[in-house]
Interface confidence: low
């Protein structure tokens, strides 16, 4: 018995749902009361999903997993697993018994992507050409660990006194710290690189020091240019600095985190004490980096309704404030592809290929297009259900008529994360196959 | 100039950034055509993506530590004659033009029948 999963290793983002594809060729009378299928870890063998004498038989991993009910009969054997997490990484082997027998095995590789970095310089004030002075980068909850580099504002590499070290916490992801030491020249730019080898995504910072700047008293609050795009589920940092001034105290700072078009308080930091989170519960200061001029705010499990404009006001003596967006994504899910009719297809029928892809944020863009890569862009009709979440479930659908063979591919794309999810399948009279992932 | 058949590499160098931060991607454009992709080739190396009509005879490749990335043209034909352009990718589909930033004045290679 042939079993099929992809070659390349499936890429999931922590938080998101991944399907292991297994496919196997059913025999013809085949039922699924003949059906033994087991997925296992590789390695160890622990039971994840099974399903026998008919009976989907459950999940035995932390009631994550699901399998496709209604795509078996087809030899459609893969696995959804849900909320991946980075214990999750690993290779996953799919077991089919029917009369004869046979497994493979497919490898799970995890992937979080580094929050844009922060730059911290010490010592930050009373600068002067020949200085010595450390610049901090630093970025979190990415995975795997990541590669940093460092360059000038040429943009030659920096590869001398530079240290960097990575710590996991408890749900394996990794924050990020590396420590570059320069001498001052009359003016300086430092640019901060961390890559995530995986989904090969850069995060970049930058600090233009300019020694020994006249002093003018303003409260300069500084915040990202782009918005920052956070995945739902996740935590996302909105960053916001200020200068304080010599003998600044946290006694002297007013902070205030609230919604741009709204005016409603989100946050607030005042008479020296964090007065806490007035957005159910789900903001937090960094308190050990409010004396240094960081201001920013930490956002939790982020929601689709938190997409928007956030203010940052500072006052000390002086006050100010600037406005970050935050922009909410949500990865659309591998597309599934149902054919109606489905059996005894002959050139010349006329089919409907619809194309499913689930909770993804913000709308998705789709594209149809044939074996040979040309966009197939007539009679196709497509529609987009936002949930209770906001998340969008999106469904196109393509009537075409069949040729001696062909295949139909349809890609949907997250404008926000560029992430495409791609479903194909090929007809070739009868029947029809579901092609393996390159 | 070369014969139907033979092999030629092309080479592009890259100055004034970080090279080994960037993919790289090989246009071509045939007299009276429109320009077309070619390959492309992520900014470690790792991975390359090809024009369908072209795997297997083309193959693109990198040296970081030269700045440089290569193509290798392999059993030329005479339909192979065009200019040839490097660009530095920025972001989208690799093999959309749009993608790309930055472009070199182009090479022109002439197959003889």
């Known amino acids: 018995l042939e079993v099929q999963v992809p070659e390349d290793p499936v890429v999931a983002l922590v938080g998101t749902d991944a399907t292991l594809c297994c496919s196997f060729s059913p025999e013809p009378g085949f039922s699924l009361a003949q059906l033994n299928l087991i997925w296992q870890l590789t390695d160890t063998k622990q039971l994840v999903h099974s399903f026998a004498e008919g009976q989907d038989q459950g999940s035995a991993y932390a009631n994550r997993t699901a399998l496709f009910p209604d795509l078996l009969a087809q030899g459609n054997a893969s696995l959804r697993l849900q909320r991946v997490r980075v214990a999750d990484e690993g290779s996953f082997t799919c077991f089919v018994s029917i009369r004869d027998f046979g497994s493979a095995a497919v490898s799970l590789q995890v992937a979080a992507p580094y929050s844009k970095p922060s730059m911290t310089l010490e010592p930050n004030k009373d600068l002067r050409p020949g200085d010595t002075v450390t610049i901090t980068c630093s970025s979190y909850q990415g995975y795997p660990e990541a590669e940093v580099f460092w360059q000038d504002g040429q943009g030659v590499p920096l590869t001398g006194n530079v240290t960097t070290s990575q710590m996991a916490n408890e749900q394996g992801l990794f924050d990020v710290h590396s420590i570059l030491r320069v001498v001052l020249g009359a003016n300086g730019t430092y640019s901060c690189l961390v890559r995530n080898p995986v989904l090969q995504q850069d995060a970049h910072s930058s600090v233009t020091i300019t020694p020994q700047r006249s002093p003018t008293g303003a409260v300069e609050v500084q915040v990202p240019e782009d918005p920052v795009v956070a995945l739902v589920g996740t935590d996302a940092t909105l960053r916001c600095s200020f200068s304080p001034e010599p003998g600044f105290s946290l006694a002297q700072l007013n902070l205030i985190w609230q919604l741009t078009d709204t005016k409603q308080l989100v946050h607030s930091f005042t008479e020296g004490r964090d007065q806490g989170s007035a957005y159910a519960n789900r903001t937090a200061l960094f308190p050990d980096l409010l004396a240094q001029g960081n201001a920013s705010l930490r956002l939790q499990r982020v929601r689709v309704a938190d997409e928007g404009s956030f203010t940052c006001f500072v006052s000390i003596r002086d006050f100010g404030s600037a406005a970050v967006s935050l922009q909410v994504a949500a990865p659309y899910s591998k597309p599934s592809m149902t054919l109606e009719p489905n059996k005894d297809l002959r050139p010349g029928d006329t089919v409907t290929i619809t194309c499913s892809s689930y909770r993804g944020y913000p709308e998705a863009e789709v594209f149809w297009q044939d074996g040979q890569g040309v966009p197939l862009t007539g009679n196709v009709t497509t529609s987009q259900m936002a949930n209770e979440q906001g998340l969008f479930d999106v469904h196109s659908v393509l009537r075409v008529v069949l040729g001696a063979n062909g295949t139909y591919s349809c890609l949907v794309r997250n404008p926000v994360l560029q992430q495409d999810a791609h479903g194909s399948v090929t007809i070739t009279g009868q029947p029809m196959t579901f092609p393996p992932e390159a | 100039l070369v014969q139907d058949g033979d092999s030629l590499r092309l080479s592009c160098k890259a100055s004034g950034g970080t090279f080994s931060s960037y993919a790289m991607g090989w246009f071509r454009q045939a007299p009276g055509q429109e320009r077309e992709f070619v390959a492309a080739?992520?900014?470690?190396?790792?991975?390359?993506y090809y024009a369908d009509n072209m795997e297997g005879r083309f193959t693109t490749s990198r040296d970081n530590a030269k700045n440089t990335v290569y193509l290798q043209m392999n059993s030329l034909k005479p339909e192979d004659t065009a200019v040839y352009y490097c660009?530095?990718?920025?972001?989208?589909?690799?093999?959309?033009?749009?993608?790309?930033?930055?472009w070199g004045q182009g090479t022109q290679v002439t197959v003889k029948p």
């Open positions: 080739i992520s900014s470690e190396g790792g991975s390359t």
């Open positions: 660009a530095v990718k920025g972001v989208g589909w690799p093999q959309e033009q749009a993608s790309y930033d930055y």
